[in-house]
């Protein structure tokens, strides 16, 4: 039960996180005009990964896309790449984790397969979250650097007389959305990895021996009552005593790679 809850919660948290990463990537407010200690302009500038916008005092907003690839700063391209990689990995992770969910039964999928898929999606969520956090952090660092550079030349003299209104940019809402979303995806991934341990089969690498009685048959499986190290009940060892006789092949268990986690 605890495994299902952990896995389900991990999935939901990751889903919210990935939705947040997508939202942050699409948002226009990655950097917004700094209004503190600045000449108050009647226009408000803000920029995203894909376009820059200007809002007039009337509320009229005009946005222009960056219709160039080569002309954009390498850092911006890197941030775009990190966010897209994060989204792609997260989307694949979500797809994998849906099939890995313990509460969903698809054919006769083995628990070991579900454990593998849970671990895979968990790792994908972790990497996705890290990509988003890295992307947002790179952009934030770029902003901080530019902020202090423009503060240093707040008023650049032109011909000694003319002053330039230096538009300084500060952290936009998308950065905070991205950080939170990346963190949630990361947490969700960790939860999936933890859930994977509970899903993993716990049998030891012994050949099962079948004892055939003439009357009421009982299959005895060594290690059947061994303590589970996972978070949930030992899923492979639920039915120890069964009414019908079993062949050796039926009760024989093979070690899973998760037995040694």
């Amino acid at each position: 039960m605890a495994v299902t809850a952990c896995q389900g919660l991990g999935f939901v948290v990751s889903l919210i996180g990935i939705a947040g990463i997508i939202a942050a990537t699409c948002m226009d407010q990655w950097s917004t005009q700094d209004l503190y200690n600045n000449p108050v302009t009647a226009v408000f500038n803000y920029q995203g990964l894909w376009r820059s916008c200007v809002r007039e005092s009337s509320g009229f907003t005009e946005c222009r896309g960056y219709f160039t690839l080569l002309g954009l700063p390498a850092m911006l391209q890197a941030v775009r790449a990190l966010m897209i990689v994060g989204i792609v990995l997260g989307a694949i992770g979500l797809l994998v984790s849906i099939f890995a969910l313990k509460c969903i039964r698809i054919g006769s999928m083995e628990d070991s397969a579900k454990a593998n898929m849970t671990l895979t999606s968990g790792i994908m969520f972790i990497v996705s979250g890290l990509c988003a956090i890295a992307g947002v952090s790179v952009f934030a660092n770029m902003l901080v650097t530019n902020f202090w550079m423009s503060t240093a030349n707040m008023y650049t003299g032109m011909g000694g007389m003319v002053q330039t209104v230096q538009t300084r940019y500060t952290f936009g809402a998308a950065l905070f959305v991205g950080w939170v979303a990346g963190g949630l995806t990361l947490i969700g991934g960790v939860m999936m990895c933890i859930a994977c341990r509970g899903l993993a089969p716990e049998e030891t690498n012994y050949k099962a021996v079948s004892y055939h009685a003439s009357g009421h048959s009982v299959a005895y499986k060594p290690g059947g009552f061994k303590a589970s190290t996972g978070f949930g009940s030992n899923t492979k060892n639920k039915k120890i005593y069964d009414g019908g006789a079993r062949t050796e092949d039926e009760v024989q268990s093979y070690p899973s790679k998760h037995d040694y986690v």
Partner: antibody
């Protein structure tokens, strides 16, 4: 077509206050900024300040802070400018002007109110 | 505050002539976000309120005759009337509508011979 109606003239005594009105018709009043501009004989135009009726957000020229108070009555689509502690320096034509939607320029102007400060 | 300096303060021309008036600001009025210059030109005829002619330094307001042309960038702006008509007798003001407080130039008075 947007129209801004202002009273033609106001005669006030020094030290007194006056409240100039500007009634808008033919547009969504709350959407656009309403600005006030002062014009003294033989001098240029001076921006006093602006108010956004939607949220009563104001912007004042620091030179007129304490002198002018901008308010709006959304129900009657009317903007008001109160001028206090009047002196002869305040004798001028006061225009209300509605901001454009697409830019910060003043697209529509009232005919102006002549404020005369005289004992 | 941004200071808008207009020149000349007045000029007298004959109908059909080309007129150029200048406006200089002590601070750049170019917004880097959209590469627009926030300068507006108004025409004030005697006994009338000002009328919007040109915004964003070069965009003509609807209904304004195409003989009026605005140009310039950052700190230097120009209003050109390609062929002056008798009805163009007025005072022309440039305005900073970028940085608060909005400021106007002292005006250029256009007189017709």
């Amino acid at each position: 077509q947007v129209q801004l109606q202002q009273p033609g003239a106001e005669l006030v005594k020094p030290g007194a206050s006056v409240k100039v009105s500007c009634k808008a018709s033919g547009s969504t009043f709350t959407t656009y900024w309403m600005h006030w501009v002062k014009k003294r004989p033989g001098q240029g135009l001076e921006w006093i300040g602006g108010i956004r009726p939607f949220d009563s957000n104001t912007n004042y020229n620091h030179k007129f802070k304490g002198k002018a108070t901008l308010t709006v009555d959304k129900a009657s689509s009317t903007a008001y400018m109160q001028l206090s502690s009047l002196t002869s320096e305040d004798s001028a034509v006061y225009y209300c002007a509605m901001g454009a939607y697409y830019s910060n320029s003043f697209a529509y102007w009232g005919q102006g109110t002549v404020v005369t400060v005289s004992a | 505050d941004i200071v808008m300096t207009q020149s000349p303060s007045s000029l007298t021309v004959t109908a059909g002539e080309k007129v150029t008036m200048n406006c200089k600001s002590n601070q750049s009025l170019l917004n880097s976000g959209n590469q627009k210059n926030y300068v507006t030109w108004y025409q004030q005829k005697p006994g009338q309120p000002p009328k919007l002619l040109i915004f964003w330094a070069s965009t003509r307001e609807s209904g304004v005759p195409d003989r009026f042309t605005g140009s310039g960038s950052e700190t230097d702006f120009t209003l050109i009337i390609s062929s002056v008509q008798a009805e163009d007798l007025a005072v022309y003001y440039c305005q900073n509508d970028y940085v608060y407080p909005f400021t106007f130039g002292s005006g250029t008075k256009l007189e017709i011979k």
